[in-house]
């Protein structure tokens, strides 16, 4: 049986203020049933960065086409990076629940840090 793996290949991502950052996340199975969300940080105070099903995230776009069938690429792009965006980003698989979805597995995280400005 295929066990779901959440793959975030970059441990560290150096970004430049004003530019766009791409955070990669792929999964190895469509199961269990349920959505993938992006967060910054961990624990109860973590910040929701992207939920495709609901919410408004004007600076976030998906890498994969949202009409793609059986998508396993949950990578996102964040535009107009500011110093406030630094932190560790996690893609998290939720298992469908009724009424609430339940966190199932998290990726290892990608730390976003500011790199030196290009000269």
């Amino acid at each position: 049986e295929e066990e779901l793996q959440m793959i975030q290949p970059e441990k560290l991502l150096l970004v430049t203020v004003g530019k766009t950052a791409t955070l990669h996340c792929t999964v190895t199975s469509l199961l269990p049933v349920g959505p993938v969300l992006w967060f910054r940080g961990v624990g109860p105070g973590r910040e929701l960065i992207y939920n495709q099903k609901e919410g408004h995230f004007p600076r976030v776009t998906t890498v994969s086409d949202l009409t793609k069938r059986n998508n396993m690429d949950f990578s996102i792009r964040i535009s107009s990076i500011t110093p406030a965006d630094v932190g560790t980003y996690y893609c998290v698989k939720f298992r469908k629940g009724s009424p609430e979805n339940v966190e199932f597995k998290s990726g290892p995280g990608t730390e976003m840090a500011l790199g030196a400005k290009p000269s």
């Epitope: 199961l31 269990p32 349920g34 099903k53 998508n71």
Partner: antibody
Framework: EVQLVESGGGVVQPGGSLRLSCAAS????????VSWVRQAPGKGLEWVST??????YYADSVKGRFTISRDNSKNTLYLQMNSLRAEDTAVYYC???????????????WGQGTLVTVSS | EIVLTQSPATLSVSPGERVTLSCRAS??????IAWYQQKPGQAPRLLIY???SRDTGIPARFSGSGSGTDFTLTISSLQSEDFGVYYC??????????FGGGTKVEIK
């Protein structure tokens, strides 16, 4: 080519039990959710149950009476139906789930169905 | 539970005519709607998903539109093989998945 072949239907008395099977081929069975959808004679479609990995979901009308399961080594989906009632009489279809975008499930392949008749 | 209401229940049309089928949801389902065709004695067949995306191999005469609560399946020029019952299904909020009651497209 994706194929879903149901079996196990038949005539059973009210209160009886039946086990349906669905043999799947042509896709990576273990990474997809699969479902049962039924259709009473002359009526519309009614979702019955879905199974992901070990996560299962049921319509209220069958909860506690029906059990969905899967055997990934045999590429087979099952539906154990207990305490059957006359209103369970229907053609039972096995369907492969498909997702779009980041969530949302619909049914992209269907079997031809197996008829279950509950009658005394 | 989200209720889907399809109209009309029956539609009598001639080959070559344009056909418009309606599906209305009891609450916002975004674009999480699929359409199926079912011919007598056969299993349903997926036509449209995500409200407007045609499934592989579905002829271009079939198109879907709408978002929120109102959805439409259009057959631009009905062919003889298109007669049957058409169902919409929502997958925005489940369990349960829910289907509309169907629209029967029959020969005039």
């Amino acid at each position: 080519e994706v194929q879903l072949v149901e079996s196990g239907g038949g005539v059973v008395q009210p209160g009886g039990s039946l086990r349906l099977s669905c043999a799947a081929s042509g896709f990576s069975f273990s990474i997809y959710a699969v479902s049962w959808v039924r259709q009473a004679p002359g009526k519309g479609l009614e979702w019955v149950s879905t199974i992901g990995a070990d996560d299962t979901y049921y319509a209220d009308s069958v909860k506690g009476r029906f059990t969905i399961s899967r055997d990934n080594s045999k590429n087979t989906l099952y539906l154990q139906m207990n305490s059957l009632r006359a209103e369970d009489t229907a053609v039972y279809y096995c369907a492969k789930d498909s997702t779009v975008g980041w969530s949302g499930d619909f049914f992209d392949y269907w079997g031809q169905g197996t008829l279950v008749t509950v009658s005394s | 539970e989200i209720v889907l209401t399809q109209s009309p229940a029956t539609l009598s049309v001639s080959p070559g005519e344009r056909v418009t089928l309606s599906c209305r949801a009891s609450q916002n389902v975004r674009s999480d709607i699929a359409w199926y065709q079912q011919k007598p004695g056969q299993a349903p067949r997926l036509l449209i998903y995500a409200a407007s995306s045609r499934d592989t191999g579905i002829p271009a005469r079939f198109s879907g539109s709408g978002s929120g609560t109102d959805f439409t399946l259009t057959i631009s020029s009905l062919q003889s093989e298109d007669f049957g019952v058409y169902y919409c299904q929502q997958y925005y909020d489940w369990p349960p998945f829910t289907f509309g009651g169907g629209t029967k497209v029959e020969i005039k």
